[in-house]
């Protein structure tokens, strides 16, 4: 079944290469198990940035080597992506799946354009 997913249109990453945004979904039922996936679209290619499955009320658990962290509160997921560089600029899309109990629901947001600007190197102090 379809499910609406909302996310901000634009986010600017910090000078340390960290970008955060909220992914909010309109849950049609009382899901207990939710899967959140962050996709990146750039140059006619879609790749999976990270994904986490969590039980409602519990923390999101990404893989140890993931560049993503997140917390959940109700139907909102606060996502943080770190280690970003200018070349990582692109459209980051939130995909939410309500896995359990049935029926399965799927929603995909319109994407958040994340702009990353590499910091200027500090000039040598002679």
């Amino acid at each position: 079944k379809a499910m609406h997913v909302a996310q901000p249109a634009v986010v600017l990453a910090s000078s340390r290469g960290i970008a955060s945004f909220v992914c909010e979904y309109a849950s049609p039922g009382k899901a207990t198990e939710v899967r959140v996936t962050v996709l990146r679209q750039a140059d006619s290619q879609v790749t999976e940035v990270c994904a986490a499955t969590y039980m409602m009320g519990n923390e999101l658990t990404f893989l140890d080597d993931s560049i993503c962290t997140g917390t959940s509160s109700g139907n909102q997921v606060n996502l943080t992506i770190q280690g970003l560089r200018a070349m990582d600029t692109g459209l980051y899309i939130c995909k939410v799946e309500l896995m359990y109990p049935p029926p399965y629901y799927l929603g995909i947001g319109n994407g958040t354009q994340i702009y990353v600007i590499d910091p200027e190197p500090c000039p040598d102090s002679d």
């Epitope: 379809a2 679209q41 006619s44 999976e48 799927l106 995909i108």
Partner: nanobody
């Protein structure tokens, strides 16, 4: 529960034609994207053609002018008319539903577009060989 059932595949000679069908049930989308994907042996799944709820269609460059996607809303059925078939069209063909029409038109020429779709049929095999 959403169900997609494909049919119409088979063995056809190069230059021949086939019409694939996908019967859909159990979904209630006011706005969505329907698509045909294919997966050749040893390769990834690629989007072939899509159609949105308004009837706008899109095709992969490799099938443009040969394949035609259409839908019958009354029958909840998606079709793919395939003409001038080539050996490189040999693959398992899947129909799929994507919940966000924003990604519909670009899907056939986007690698990894399957991420935008969440419901899949079991597939139907198309073999083009003499």
């Amino acid at each position: 529960e959403v169900q997609l059932v494909e049919s119409g595949g088979g063995l056809v000679q190069p230059g021949g034609s086939l019409r694939l069908s996908c019967a859909a049930s159990g979904y209630t989308y006011s706005r969505h994207c329907l698509g045909w994907f294919r997966q050749a042996p040893g390769k990834g799944r690629e989007a072939v053609s899509t159609i949105d709820s308004g009837g706008s269609t899109s095709y992969a460059d490799s099938v443009k002018g040969r394949f035609t996607i259409s839908r019958d809303n009354a029958k909840n059925t998606l079709y793919l008319q395939m003409n001038s078939l080539r050996p490189e069209d040999t693959a398992v063909y899947y129909c799929a539903i994507g919940p966000n029409p924003r990604y519909c038109s670009g899907a056939p020429n986007t690698r990894g577009a399957e991420h935008y779709f969440g419901y899949w049929g079991q597939g139907t095999l198309v073999t083009v060989s003499s």
